[in-house]
């Protein structure tokens, strides 16, 4: 893809220092779609336009990242810039409407489970970790593993700990994690599948 990322970067680089600061502050409170986490305040405030673009894309992927950026710009009163960003990202992109044949997922690697393909994004973006643990307890996770994940202080560190056990899992164990994700954060799964 790349088009949306470039458009986000272009928009952010056109902000004044004061506007960029305001953008970051608004990003900390803007309503997010279900299934998305917030970029941590500490990291966010020190970022330049390039770092912020990369962070937006890694946290929200290109499509939603661009939409979110446009929403914040609009909220700042920068309607024209928001419109330009959305026009740039919609040009030659966007989801196929109902009834249109969807392209094959050529980016997906055969033989690599969805969970493995999207490891980094899942670590960054899964928020409902406790729910996952309860769904996997006794089926995939031992009591010791369950407690070890729960003991971690943040969602990303919990997910990182959970992923430390997956090399020993077979395909069906990974499917059970994926089922739990579909049930708890369906939008995230759908978004990753599109990416």
């Amino acid at each position: 893809m790349g088009r949306a990322r470039d458009a986000i970067l272009d928009a952010l680089e056109n902000l004044t220092a004061e506007e960029l600061k305001k953008f970051k502050l608004k990003l900390l409170s803007v309503p997010l779609r279900e299934g998305y986490g917030r970029i941590p305040r500490g990291a966010l405030l020190s970022m330049d336009a390039l770092d912020l673009t990369d962070k937006l894309v890694s946290f929200y992927l290109e499509t939603y990242g661009a939409e979110l950026t446009a929403n914040v710009l609009r909220d700042m009163g920068l309607q024209e810039m928001a419109g330009q960003l959305q026009a740039a990202t919609h040009q030659g992109s966007g989801a196929a409407p109902a009834g249109i044949q969807a392209p094959p997922q050529s980016a997906a690697k055969p033989g690599l489970h969805f969970i493995d393909q999207h490891r980094a994004a899942l670590i960054a973006r899964v928020t409902n970790v406790e729910w996952l643990l309860d769904a996997l307890y006794g089926k995939v996770l031992t009591d010791e593993q369950y407690q070890a994940v729960r003991a971690e202080p943040t969602n990303p560190s919990k997910m990182r700990k959970l992923f430390s056990f997956t090399p020993a899992w077979n395909w069906t164990c990974k499917d059970l994690l994926l089922q739990a994700l579909r049930e708890s954060q369906s939008y995230l799964v759908e978004d990753l599948e599109r990416s």
């Epitope: 109902a98 009834g99 969807a102 094959p104 997922q105 997906a108 690697k109 055969p110 033989g111 690599l112 489970h113 969805f114 393909q117 077979n170 395909w171 069906t172 164990c173 499917d175 059970l176 994926l178 089922q179 579909r182 049930e183 369906s186 939008y187 799964v189 759908e190 990753l192 599948e193």
Partner: antibody, heavy 122, light 107 residues
Framework: QVQLVQSGAEVKKPGSSVKVSCKAS????????IHWVRQAPGQGLEWMGY????????MYNEKFQGRVTITADKSTSTAYMELSSLRSEDTAVYYC???????????????WGQGTLVTVSS | EIVLTQSPATLSLSPGERATLSCHAS??????LSWYQQKPGQAPRLLIY???NLHTGIPARFSGSGSGTDFTLTISSLEPEDFAVYYC?????????FGQGTKLEIK
Amino acid sequence: QVQLVQSGAEVKKPGSSVKVSCKASGYTFTDQTIHWVRQAPGQGLEWMGYIYPGDASAMYNEKFQGRVTITADKSTSTAYMELSSLRSEDTAVYYCARPLYSYASYYWFAYWGQGTLVTVSS
Amino acid sequence: EIVLTQSPATLSLSPGERATLSCHASQNINVWLSWYQQKPGQAPRLLIYKSSNLHTGIPARFSGSGSGTDFTLTISSLEPEDFAVYYCQQGQSYPLTFGQGTKLEIK
């Protein structure tokens, strides 16, 4: 192109077992799951379970747990479904099916075998 | 397990008419639903996956919509070859389940 070719029709006695085969071609056998779905005469479709030949792990519908075993032979790219303790209500067409993409976040069945009729009768 | 209920059980229409088939899930399945067509003596054929994506080679007169618990398969203008049984299937959780089917017959 992807092809799934199943073994021929079987007539079995109640209490016995049946083993249906499904030979796959046109893709890398170990990269995709193979599922089994059955259909009793004039009835709907019922998912029985799947195998992932890459690591031989299988998942089953609890309704059949203990009676169904799904296996795969990587050397011949063939999946097998064995159903034991057969009863008359197991009379059905048994299909093997392969999803559109096993490595995506769902299982939708784009490729099907021709079906194998298993008749259970005394 | 998730139960899928299709309605109507039988739909009698003429070629050229619009067909609307429904599938209701017993719990939220988001967009994880597909539709199949089956003709007598044949294996099912995938039409729509993930609620609204048209499978390769399927005519554009077929379309799918819905999310959560209610889904619809629409055939905009029926062709003679469309008269068959249609099944929905959920991919949200195990065991994977199918609806009981809707028979689309010629009026």
